[in-house]
């Protein structure tokens, strides 16, 4: 969470941004809020990126003005125009690329004053893992798959029954490059699993951490997955 202040005459306005992460190839949002101002035509929003000449996006007089926009962002950005008067300057970013990572500035000018705040935007790939029982194996085993990760993550297994156990000797993890030659498919197999136990497959890089849980009993298989972005907020 980054809060910036600005001065215009005697007036400060508070601008707040949140560090966030973008999933490459998907659409993302760079979050920025400011003190609301009912006078829409007097609000100017400018998004800038460190190291880039030209603007990422500009919104003024109630509409976009992209005449100064850098070409790498052409056709890829939008503010939530109907939410500007309530203080939302967040930026939608289409088809996130690795090169979108960096430091952004959200600059605001209203009839009340002006202010800005920086935002660190990380880019990578992250996806939910899915665990299945591998019945083809000679012994009972579990297969954990996640379709898109970048940078290359670490993979670890844990179990409810054998808490603290090291499963690296009884698991095998591989990373397969996807067709776009950036992201990778993660596959990890855990061997010699036992019935009536809950196993967790944990995939983590510097952007996100994902966990898939599976509970195998004689009568059913229960699964659960979750994903959290790291260092956000």
């Amino acid at each position: 969470l980054i809060i910036g202040f600005g001065i215009s005459g005697k007036h400060f306005i508070t601008v707040t941004t949140f560090t966030s992460a973008g999933n490459i190839g998907e659409d993302g949002t760079l979050s920025c809020t400011f003190e609301p101002d009912i006078k829409l035509n007097g609000i100017v929003i400018q998004w800038l990126k460190e190291g880039i000449k030209g603007l990422v996006h500009e919104f003024k007089e109630g509409k976009d003005d992209l005449s100064q926009q850098h070409e790498m962002f052409r056709g890829r950005t939008a503010v939530f125009a109907d939410q500007v008067v309530v203080g939302n300057a967040s930026l939608r970013l289409k088809n996130v690329q690795l090169t979108d990572a960096g430091t952004y500035t959200c600059y605001i000018r209203t009839s009340k004053g002006k202010g800005n705040a920086n935002l660190e935007y990380k880019t990578g790939a992250f996806s939910m893992p899915e665990i299945n029982v591998d019945y083809n194996a000679s012994s009972e085993s579990l297969r954990c798959e996640a379709p898109r990760w970048f940078p290359q993550p670490t993979v670890a297994w844990a179990s409810q029954v054998d808490q603290g156990a090291n499963f690296s000797e009884v698991s095998n993890t591989s990373f397969e490059l996807n067709s776009e030659n950036v992201t990778m498919k993660v596959v990890s197999v855990l061997y010699n699993v036992t019935i009536n136990n809950t196993y967790s497959c944990m995939i983590e890089n510097d952007i996100a951490k994902a966990t898939g849980d599976i509970k195998v009993t004689d009568s059913e298989v229960k699964r659960r997955s979750q994903l959290q972005l790291l260092n956000s907020g």
């Epitope: 190839g25 998907e26 659409d27 509409k63 976009d64 003005d65 992209l66 005449s67 100064q68 926009q69 070409e71 052409r74 056709g75 890829r76 950005t77 939008a78 939608r92 289409k94 088809n95 067709s179 776009e180």
Partner: antibody
Framework: QVQLQESGPGLVKPSETLSLTCTVS????????WSWIRQPPGKGLEWIGY???????NNNPSLKSRVTISVDTSKNQFSLKLISVTAADTAVYYC?????????????WGQGTLVTVSS | EIVMTQSPATLSVSPGERATLSCRAS??????LAWYQQKPGQAPRLLIY???TRATGIPARFSGSGSGTEFTLTIRSLQSEDFAVYYC?????????FGGGTKLEIK
């Protein structure tokens, strides 16, 4: 109500230059992106390229560097030039407005003009 | 470039029934997809953008769904004026690309 009207010759000789102009009425050319799209007879649609009122453009790589799109804000017009045409460039050429700066659907279209490339 | 594939090429449906048209992208386009209707001798007409948002003035019987690589345009209770060619178009990446079209004809 925004209206678009294509104009230009309907017949162009092979190896020559195809030139079309789109006149926008009922609204300003500023604040929107504008595109050219073509459709060969009996076939599907192909995006040619876009222009913004500030003059920034982007073209379909399939047309290599044969395409030039320009804008004249004082006349509320934008134009297409396609050099070194062949019979494969025979198509109905449409000009269209991009719906908004993020959702690149085309909400207003000209009626289209058929350009035939033939000697 | 992203290749858009529409199926079927021709769909025969009776008036009053439901038509389901499919569009598949060669890679994920998120929700950055539009649908158009084109009648003979006319320019295409924008029906749907953002995969599921109806454009201004488009009747509620038209609905779009899907994200990623699989998309569907559904027209319920077909009217006589709905028989036309339908195109999908992605705007996730340059160049913008269209599908080959689905011709919706009267059964």
């Amino acid at each position: 109500q925004v209206q678009l009207q294509e104009s230009g010759p309907g017949l162009v000789k092979p190896s020559e230059t195809l030139s079309l102009t789109c006149t926008v009425s009922g609204g300003s050319i500023s604040s929107y992106y504008w595109s050219w799209i073509r459709q060969p007879p009996g076939k599907g649609l192909e995006w040619i390229g876009y222009i913004y009122y500030s003059g920034s453009t982007n073209n379909n790589p399939s047309l290599k560097s044969r395409v030039t799109i320009s804008v004249d804000t004082s006349k509320n017009q934008f134009s297409l030039k396609l050099i070194s045409v062949t019979a494969a460039d025979t198509a109905v050429y449409y000009c269209a407005r991009v719906y908004n700066n993020y959702d690149w659907g085309f909400d207003y279209w000209g009626q289209g003009t058929l350009v035939t490339v033939s000697s | 470039e992203i290749v858009m594939t529409q199926s079927p090429a021709t769909l025969s449906v009776s008036p009053g029934e439901r038509a389901t048209l499919s569009c598949r992208a060669s890679q994920s386009v998120s929700s950055n997809l539009a649908w158009y209707q084109q009648k003979p001798g006319q320019a295409p007409r924008l029906l749907i953008y953002g995969a599921s948002t109806r454009a201004t003035g488009i009747p509620a019987r038209f609905s779009g769904s899907g994200s990623g690589t699989e998309f569907t345009l559904t027209i319920r209770s077909l009217q006589s004026e709905d028989f036309a060619v339908y195109y999908c178009q992605q705007y996730h990446n340059w160049p913008l690309t269209f599908g080959g079209g689905t011709k919706l004809e009267i059964k």
